[in-house]
Amino acid sequence: APVPPGEDSKDVAAPHRQPLTSSERIDKQIRYILDGISALRKETCNKSNMCESSKEALAENNLNLPKMAEKDGCFQSGFNEETCLVKIITGLLEFEVYLEYLQNRFESSEEQARAVQMSTKVLIQFLQKKAKNLDAITTPDPTTNASLLTKLQAQNQWLQDMTTHLILRSFKEFLQSSLRALRQM
């Protein structure tokens, strides 16, 4: 598993550093999760040829994975800090069921999959502290999530590989869009 945030080599090189600010902590947490996703994608790509499939071919799936759109207030045009923050937190909460699905999908990177899941929970907590309007954040329904998880796990092998690839790719993109937006806040 990757080194937890706050313990990487760059920190060792600069021992007299001030304690991390809230923004730095969030930035670092996202980068840590992205490292984990990168390792998981490596295993997925080695196992199947999904990574060579075009975006268009993969788009025809019935997964409702969170995605940033202009209306979410995270893009430069119409940027809105509070709306965007709500979108980021809501999106991460929606991804949690998919991260749960990933838990039994890896052999050599089982630990890594757990690290991504746990780190995402921590990231959500960091962001919730930053948000002013917590009432606007909708938490996914546990019953709906449970039935979605059952449905995903009942798919055939090829579809499960496809689903794993799509989750990792979409989660990576969502985190990158979040990272970009958070640096403007």
Partner: antibody, heavy 119, light 104 residues
Amino acid sequence: QVTLKESGPALVKPTQTLTLTCTFSGFSLTTSGMCVSWIRQPPGKALEWLALIYWDDDKRYNPSLRSRLTITKDTSKNQVVLTMTNMDPVDTATYYCARSYDDYLYYALDYWGQGTLVT
Amino acid sequence: DIVMTQSPSSLSASVGDRVTITCRASRNINTYLNWYQQKPGKAPKLLVHSASTLQSGAPSRFSGSGYGTEFTLIISSLQPDDFATYYCQQGYNTLTFGPGTKLE
């Protein structure tokens, strides 16, 4: 391999609009983490970043030039277009397009075009 | 806006010298700092990214360090090919270049 090439007029009259095209190959501007930037350099002066466009069509502009710049992409043609309105003699420079691609959006420009001189 | 400053603006050195160029950011940019080398009439070349990672293909005599607001580029033993202008660039909130350091 990755290549980028700028094209556009070498000469522009004051008040006119400059349109520059960056044609690239070896990468896709739909891959998450991929960005294309425009940078300029007046003769004998420093580099100045102008604008960038992301894989998901989000855009950023240099605040001091924002009102004059528009950046767009055509992924099917592998092109990024920059337009700059109300050109002035002080806009004489070599205009470069460059790409950045990494997970954390460090905006490290790892591949550059050769540049095009606009007077 | 994040403003980048570089020192010195120009520098005379000899082959074999150890050269240090400093770059400062007007606010904390974490490790979102890149270094470029540019020769007359050519496009810049990426040397170091994320403050301390040497770009693939860049000579190992180049190294970068720093965090937050202060960064350095070091050339451990100057070679004839290293006489050029060096720019730092922040990548925390889009991009800003430093004014450059001319090494002659």
